[in-house]
Interface confidence: medium
């Protein structure tokens, strides 16, 4: 039975050219996290964090994506095209798969606030 829940940074905004942290957290389960996949809105993989084999940033993103903090992901040099949904997929043993959603809005305005509150989607 899957008892866990994914908490995410929810809907966040950041300014063009800046950076943002995408963060998910799995709670309420003792399941072992084997792997976390980070995907973009078009389902392309940004990065993978395997518990034993380590981080892998996909080539298309290696100049703009930094691993961490923790199981999260840092997007740098943001462009307007980065606006959209991001998904964290937790592959766990023995529970199975958990999936969280984050919506990132990249703003032109220099007064854009970067909110980083945790919320359950």
């Amino acid at each position: 039975m899957m008892t866990g829940t994914i908490e995410t940074t929810g809907n966040i905004s950041a300014k063009k050219g800046g950076s943002v942290i995408l963060q998910c957290h799995l709670s309420s389960t003792m399941a072992q996290v084997t792997q976390v996949n980070w995907e973009q809105h078009d389902h392309s993989l940004l990065a993978i964090r395997n518990a034993e084999l380590g981080w892998h940033i996909y080539p298309a993103f290696k100049d703009r994506v930094a691993p961490g903090p923790g199981l999260g992901l840092t997007l740098q040099s943001l462009t307007m095209n980065d606006t959209g949904e991001y998904f964290c997929t937790y592959h766990t043993y023995p529970d199975g798969t958990y999936r969280g959603r984050i919506f990132l809005e990249v703003l032109e305005s220099s007064v854009a606030e970067h909110s980083a509150r945790f919320q359950i989607p």
Epitope: T34, N50, E52, L53, H56, Y93
Partner: antibody
């Protein structure tokens, strides 16, 4: 720190039996698949057998099928390889290894890579 | 059984040079391919998994590429500790198989 220590190797006559053990520590043994890989003197690596984390499924190389049996005792954190009807060509260093799981989100299946290895135990089959 | 053929059998190079090792599969293994390094008297060490991903702690000078039947391990600039035997392995299906190995030796 993951540690795997093989034992039980030695010199044995053709046709006889031998049981190898692999004592595991530093990880939750019951959560991981385990494998045996061997290497004949001066030769390359040869996969011998695999066993799932709970012992429910076992897989063997054709060269040892029907003669070797892989098993595990999760309460003792130990992997075994029972080798019967030994032949000269079974002479090798036998390594146990622990798999690390990687989920392929394209083919939607897990792959198992051999990340942690013991130092090996030498089995010599000779009359 | 999937047969993996490695070439060349021996590669003689000097420290600082680039090493390119090849592994060819008799049928497609998708990206289910690993590369291991083995030094004399030691157990193998996992370098690359899923054809192109570096395992934890592996230096960036090691890189893997390819999919299907043709794979390459590249060492961008050989360090003294890189002279060893390298094996490819497919984990696409049973029986799991290794290539015959490529020995990278000092020229």
């Amino acid at each position: 720190e993951v540690q795997l220590v093989e034992s039980g190797g030695g010199v044995v006559q053709p046709g006889r039996s031998l049981r190898l053990s692999c004592a595991a520590s530093g990880f939750t043994f019951e959560s991981y698949g385990m494998v045996w890989v061997r290497q004949a003197p001066g030769k390359g690596l040869e996969w011998v057998a695999s066993i799932l984390y709970d012992g429910s499924n076992r897989y063997y190389a054709d060269s040892v099928k029907g003669r070797f049996t892989v098993s595990r005792d999760n309460s003792k954190n130990t992997l075994y390889l029972q080798m019967n009807s030994l032949r000269a060509e079974d002479t090798a260093v036998y390594y146990c290894a622990r798999v690390s799981y990687y989920y392929d989100s394209v083919e939607l299946r897990w792959a198992e890579y051999f990340q942690h290895w013991g130092q090996g135990t030498l089995v010599t089959v000779s009359s | 059984e999937i047969v993996l053929t490695q070439s060349p059998a021996t590669l003689s190079l000097s420290p600082g040079e680039r090493a390119t090792l090849s592994c060819r599969a008799s049928q497609s293994v998708s990206s289910y391919l690993a590369w291991y390094q083995q030094k004399p008297g030691q157990a193998p060490r996992l370098l690359i998994y899923d054809a192109s991903k570096r395992a934890t702690g592996i230096p960036a000078r090691f890189s893997g590429s390819g999919s299907g039947t043709d794979f390459t391990l590249t060492i961008s600039s050989l360090e003294p500790e890189d002279f060893a035997v390298y094996y490819c392995q497919q984990v696409h299906n049973f029986p799991l198989t290794f290539g015959g190995g490529t020995k990278v030796e000092i020229k």
